[in-house]
């Protein structure tokens, strides 16, 4: 029978080294055996390159294409072939279809004055356009209570978030994950990072009655304090305006 594309290729670029295209065939297909995606930059002298697709599901194919460090003007001509039969032809501009790389190495550290310091790595080298464009969303959830989750938007520079332990339930196990997007490129969200889990061992203040009360701000500089307040503000803002943003 004839080979047909059910959902035409949808492509995204990490804007540094790879573009990924995904499409759906009208019936289960051995993507690598039956199909080829050719791609060529619309630029004088650019050669034609071929991508061998892989199966994501029975009828869904995915192709990962190495690209050079993308720039805004880059436009690729894409052609999907089944042998000598051209199934689909289109163009793709990486700068208009950005999906950032996933933030890496998410870690949680106990910090001064009953705060947790969440840190992760910016997935782009400093010389890449996206390095300074990323903002992040951090999702913190209680492993045993699906209703207990918080979303923090990190819009300041620096891949860190300080959380006041008091905003989380004492003795509960929490998981955090982070994803990124680039506002100026009107990107989609990156995939979520792997989760990292920790135990929130903060004791509520009332349990300290009759005990010496430590100064919660001792040794905390004004920057750190501002970050805590900022994170709490964002959390409150997210909670009350969630439907506007997502």
């Amino acid at each position: 029978g004839s080979v047909k594309v059910l959902h035409e290729p949808s492509c995204f670029s990490d804007y540094i080294s790879t573009s990924v295209c995904q499409w759906k065939m009208d019936h289960p297909t051995n993507c690598s055996a039956e199909l080829r995606l050719s791609y060529q930059l619309d630029f004088m002298g650019s050669e034609n390159h071929t991508c061998v697709p892989e199966n994501r599901e029975d009828s869904v194919c995915v192709c990962s294409m190495p690209i050079d460090d993308a720039v805004e003007a880059d436009v690729y001509q894409l052609d999907l072939w089944a042998g000598q039969q051209l199934l689909w032809s289109g163009s793709f501009q990486p700068s208009k279809h950005v999906k950032p790389r996933t933030p890496g190495n998410l870690t949680v550290h106990p910090n001064i004055s009953h705060t947790w310091l969440l840190m992760w790595t910016n997935p782009y080298p400093t010389e890449n356009h996206l390095h300074s464009e990323l903002t992040y969303m951090v999702n913190v959830s209680n492993d045993n209570d699906p209703e207990d989750f918080k979303v923090y938007n990190v819009t300041y520079m620096g891949p860190t978030l300080r959380l006041a332990a008091s905003t989380l339930k004492s003795g509960a196990s929490y998981s955090a994950r982070v994803r990124a997007w680039a506002q100026t490129y009107n990107s989609t969200w990156s995939d979520w990072s792997p989760s990292t889990t920790w135990l929130n061992y903060y004791e509520p203040w009332e349990q300290h009655l009759g005990k010496p009360i430590p100064n919660p701000l001792l040794g905390l500089d004004s920057t750190g304090l501002n970050d805590i307040f900022e994170a709490q503000k964002i959390e409150w803002h997210e909670h009350h305006h969630h439907h506007h943003h997502h």
Epitope: F43, G45, D68
Partner: antibody, heavy 125, light 112 residues
Framework: EVQLVESGGDLVKPGGSLRLSCVAS????????MTWVRQAPGKGLQWVSF????????YYADAVKGRFTISRDNAKNTLYLQMNSLRAEDTAVYYC??????????????????WGQGTLVTVSS | DIVMTQTPLSLSVSPGETASISCRSS???????????LDWYLQKPGQSPQGLIY???KRASGVPDRFSGSGSGTDFTLRISRVEANDTGVYYC?????????FGQGTKLEIK
């Protein structure tokens, strides 16, 4: 040392044919696009044709399209220009030059960074 | 086609002085930040052309730093400081952005 040596220039009658060759040495020939540029006596430089490293992409000036064919033999490190239906206005010194690196997705550009010594083509009856 | 226009067409400069040649393109040669596909070539009398500047401002290998290129988009300048007798020849600008590649008419530099 990077070097280009052209040959094949000659006196030919209008309507005749000629094949120019350009032998390259001192660099990885297959990785680079190559270009032909010509210069009529006492005139400026005029681009003629371009071929990518693999030979998969070719471009021509309107003045020669359909009459000239650019090709390359990467095993022999040689660039060719087949010239058919020659006209008096094709009289010029023909230079080959090394153009952009095309083995990368976006060609890396260094200008026409090496030129041959040129070969003279004279079309006259 | 992109039209390249050079000015002046001839120039006479005393040794040690600075020579400036302008080149204007009919459309922008800026592909991305820092990548203007504009070259400068020198053809000395009786010789093949040789590359001086590529991508608007990058000096080709072996070219002295007396030669400098500047400009972006459609307006470019080649400056030759401390001109020497050996700099005599015809200078061409060329756009390498798209086919057909096109050259300026050439500027003849004469040393007084």
């Amino acid at each position: 040392e990077v070097q280009l040596v052209e040959s094949g220039g000659d006196l030919v009658k209008p309507g005749g044919s000629l094949r120019l060759s350009c032998v390259a040495s001192g660099f990885t020939f297959r990785d680079y696009a190559m270009t032909w540029v010509r210069q009529a006596p006492g005139k400026g430089l005029q681009w003629v044709s371009f071929i990518s490293g693999s030979g998969g992409k070719t471009y021509y000036a309107d003045a020669v399209k359909g009459r000239f064919t650019i090709s390359r033999d990467n095993a022999k490190n040689t660039l060719y220009l087949q010239m058919n239906s020659l006209r008096a206005e094709d009289t010029a010194v023909y230079y080959c030059a090394v153009d952009r690196l095309t083995k990368t997705i976006r060609p890396q550009y260094y200008g026409l960074w090496v030129w041959g010594q040129g070969t003279l083509v004279t079309v006259s009856s | 086609d992109i039209v390249m226009t050079q000015t002046p067409l001839s120039l006479s400069v005393s040794p040690g002085e600075t020579a400036s040649i302008s080149c204007r393109s009919s459309q922008s040669l800026l592909y991305s930040i820092g990548y203007n596909y504009l070259d400068w070539y020198l053809q000395k009398p009786g010789q093949s052309p040789q590359g001086l500047i590529y991508l608007g401002s990058k000096r080709a290998s072996g070219v002295p730093d007396r030669f400098s290129g500047s400009g972006s988009g459609t307006d470019f300048t080649l400056r030759i400081s401390r001109v020497e007798a050996n700099d005599t020849g015809v200078y061409y600008c060329m756009q390498g952005l798209q086919s057909p590649l096109t050259f300026g008419q050439g500027t003849k530099l004469e040393i007084k």
